[in-house]
């Protein structure tokens, strides 16, 4: 792929920043080395540039190719390589650049931690919220549904915006927005439950902006194994934030003596993080790390983007696989603590629960396991992929497939072990979840490989939408429905309460196997789709007036 002047602007014609236009004009005149207006080497001090060593450049997938030579600064030629060696040109300092990009990735990951911390702080004090507002279980379900639905609906909108406008501004505004809404929601009077519902919907919109756009910035800051590592860190924020959310919720409530204060912690941190994003995250141009030039302006419509994504088989199959993961995590997260409590009732090691919270201890253990396995899974997945890439080009989807299929076995074993040993069940949960979570970062990486930079935010958004729609938006309810259906046809006893929920949860490993199959299908098309994406990026970087993608 050809190194042009620098990673470049947005599709759809809207510029990343007004300043970029001025920078580009200056760059075309006289290009400078590191610390200048920024060529391939740097984007100003601490910017997110990508260094060019001679005329060797990195492609979309991070592989190294020789760039064709030509007059410096000419569109379609490696102007950077030539000018970087020119008289008086300073070579970029990779260490400081790495630090700048590392700091940006760290801030984005911190933002993701806060996203989930905020979401799960509410989960941590949900019983208090229910008690205070007099919320019935169906009302608590409504809070969850409104959040997920607004998140789902908002994600594609932010995907569209994220591919066309200044991403860090959208990110910061999203964080400021949900922070303000969450903070305000801590003051909602008892009689206005509907305002609480509305606030959760608004928080869903705010958080959708972040979940959709942040990974694409990381995708534009790094390539290959570094990108996998950074996405791993970013996605480890999910279990970390979730765990911290539960801890924050309960500990702040205990310290302040009032659950309302629990909702005031994440907004304060959110405001700080939003400000840090504005200051420290560079306004990376799409495809920056992929060495794309100023000509990368895919002026394609949202409809054409969607058509292209639906035709991208690797993307479609990996999205369906992600939905399977989401289905399983959503269902297991909601029902496993209660299932294990019922197992203990059957084993006569616990009393039948008549007054909630039922299985509070199991919820705590399960939360801790989820937090740790999230970390372990992300690390294991990233490590395994890194190693497998040395053996095969299809490493990413294959590691995911093996993780999913292995996970299905251990999820099945949970229900076998639970009948006789709770410890055994927890071990199976531990291994099963580790394998299940091993594909989080890799799936994001697959998307970065097979989707061109100007469509990534839309792709992440659509994937988020489908994974919620087909996954955790309905799975907890479906499991509950199946369990009730089984229980209606059996005699009323603690044993059948346990068995009916177990049989219903057995749907999860089957869905996980299906997800594994989808990853195997992804592996079939991965290499060709990746090559096609690189080819499209080459076309985008070419000088012709109109580029059809």
């Amino acid at each position: 792929m050809m190194c042009l002047e620098c990673a470049s602007a947005a599709a759809g014609g809207a510029e990343e920043e007004e300043a970029d236009a001025e920078r580009r004009r200056r760059r075309r005149g006289a290009q400078r080395g590191a610390g200048g207006s920024g060529c391939c080497g740097a984007r100003g001090a601490g910017g997110a540039g990508v260094s060019a060593a001679g005329d060797e450049v990195q492609t979309l997938s991070g592989s190294v190719r020789r760039a064709p030579t030509g007059p410096p600064g000419t569109p379609g030629t490696p102007g950077c390589a030539a000018t970087a060696k020119g008289p008086g040109a300073q070579q970029p300092k990779p260490a400081s650049l790495g630090r700048g990009r590392g700091a940006a990735a760290a801030i984005l990951s911190l933002g993701n931690v806060l996203n989930y911390l905020d979401r799960y702080t509410v989960a941590g004090v949900l019983l208090d919220i229910q008690q205070h507002f007099g919320v019935k279980d169906r009302g608590a379900g409504l809070l969850q549904s409104v959040f997920i639905c607004s998140f789902m609906v908002a994600a594609p909108i932010f995907g569209y915006l994220g591919d066309r406008f200044n991403r860090k501004v959208i990110l910061s505004c999203g964080i400021f927005f949900w922070s303000a809404v969450t903070f305000s929601s801590s003051f909602i009077p008892q009689q206005y439950f509907w305002l609480l519902v509305l606030s959760r919907g608004l928080v869903g919109i705010g958080e959708a902006s972040y979940s959709t756009i942040a990974p694409t910035i990381i995708g534009d800051l790094f390539t290959k194994n570094t990108r996998t590592l950074m996405l791993s860190v970013f996605y480890f924020a999910i279990p970390l934030g979730s765990g911290l959310g539960y801890i924050t919720g309960s500990s702040v409530k205990q310290a302040a003596g009032d659950w309302h204060w629990a909702l005031r912690v994440s907004p304060v941190l959110g405001m700080i993080t939003g400000t840090l994003i504005l200051i420290l995250v560079p306004a990376t141009k799409r495809g920056h790390a992929d060495q794309l030039g100023d000509q990368l302006k895919a002026r394609t419509s949202w409809l054409r983007d969607m058509k292209a994504l639906i035709r991208n088989r690797s993307y479609v199959f990996s999205s369906l696989a992600t939905s399977a993961v989401s289905f399983a995590t959503g269902a297991l997260g909601m029902w496993i603590p209660l299932y294990l409590h019922r197992a203990q009732v059957v084993q006569k090691t616990a009393e039948t629960c008549n007054s909630p919270p039922c299985g509070a201890k199991d919820s705590l253990i399960f939360g801790a396991i989820t937090c740790f396995t999230g970390f372990l899974g992300v690390v294991t997945g990233a490590g395994a992929t890194r190693w497998c890439r040395l053996k095969t080009q299809r490493a990413d989807p294959l590691v995911c497939a093996v993780g999913m299929l292995g996970s299905a076995i251990f999820i099945c074993l949970i229900f076998v072990a639970a009948k006789s040993s709770i410890v055994g069940a927890y071990i199976c949960i531990f291994v099963g979840e580790t394998l299940l979570f091993s594909n989080w970062a890799i799936t994001a990486d697959i998307l970065m490989y097979v989707v061109i930079p100007t469509r990534r935010a839309t792709a992440v958004a659509l994937q988020s939408f489908t994974s919620h729609l087909l996954g955790d938006a309905g799975s907890p309810y479906l499991i509950g429905f199946i369990s009730d259906l089984i229980r209606q046809s059996t005699k009323d006893s603690p044993l059948w309460e346990f068995l009916s929920l177990g049989y219903a949860l057995m749907l999860c490993p089957f869905v996980v196997v299906l997800g594994g199959m989808f990853f195997l299908a992804t592996a079939l098309f991965f290499v060709s789709d990746r090559a096609r994406a690189e080819q499209q990026v080459n076309q985008l970087a070419m000088p012709p007036a109109s580029v059809k993608v």
């Epitope: 007099g134 019935k136 169906r138 409504l142 008892q190 009689q191 007054s355």
Partner: antibody
């Protein structure tokens, strides 16, 4: 029209038991939270116990003064709420009111929008 | 537990006068206060919910105000049927508690 009718009161000795019953009509009982509130002769009102609907797992809450001695329960098929009172004391002497909490489908108010006529319970040796 | 204090314990007024009954909470309870009227030998009835929200069937002369810790029940031009005991109740947190009551009597 909403109606709450309490029965089961009377004169009992300290340490004995009594079960109050409240028959309801005029609203969807299974979706509604119910409470018992008492009033000692010449004194103010005191909340005793609350039972939520099945959509809240029929969770029960009690005042500290009666916790462990009184049990609130409900029978949705009969639209009735009960208060089982064990180990009765002199200070439990009061008029016991069956009350209804206003319902909003997704949530419920903790205030009492309808009250029964009350039933007298006298604990005396 | 949240303690509610009502003042004055007894209030003597002549019919046609306007009165204000006070209820103070031991901690901030937003607007989670409700007012009841109990006539002699009758069951209580709900007058005002959430500090200021009116109830269907209750005369418009009854109104409520306040937030946080201090609340007022106002009766505009007292009528003969209004002479009874008034209780405030908090629902901010369990256990649900009532104030000791204010008795409104004829002067």
């Amino acid at each position: 029209e909403v109606q709450l009718v309490e029965t089961g009161g009377g004169l009992v000795r300290p340490g004995s038991s009594l079960k109050l019953s409240c028959a309801t009509s005029g609203f969807t009982f299974s979706d509604t939270w119910m409470s018992w509130v008492r009033q000692a002769p010449g004194k103010g009102l005191e909340w005793v116990a609350l039972i939520k609907d099945k959509n809240s797992n029929s969770e029960a809450n009690y005042a500290e003064s009666i916790k462990g001695r009184f049990t609130i329960s409900r029978d949705d098929s009969k639209s009735r709420v009960y208060l089982q009172m064990n180990t009765l004391r002199d200070q439990d002497t009061a008029t016991y009111y069956c009350t209804r909490h206003e319902d909003f489908y997704y949530y419920s108010g903790y205030y009492f929008d309808y009250w029964g006529q009350g039933v007298m319970v006298t604990v005396s040796s | 537990d949240i303690v509610l204090t009502q003042s004055p314990p007894t209030l003597s007024v002549t019919p046609g006068e306007s009165v204000s009954l006070s209820c103070r909470a031991s901690q901030g309870i937003s607007t989670s206060i409700h007012w009841y009227q109990q006539r002699s030998n009758e069951s209580p009835r709900l007058l005002i919910k959430y500090a200021s929200q009116s109830i269907a069937g209750i005369p418009s002369r009854f109104s409520g105000s306040g937030s946080g810790t201090d609340f007022i029940l106002s009766i505009n031009r007292v009528e003969s049927e209004d002479f009874s005991v008034y209780y405030c109740q908090q629902t901010y947190s369990l256990p649900l508690t009532f104030g000791p009551g204010t008795k409104l009597e004829v002067k």
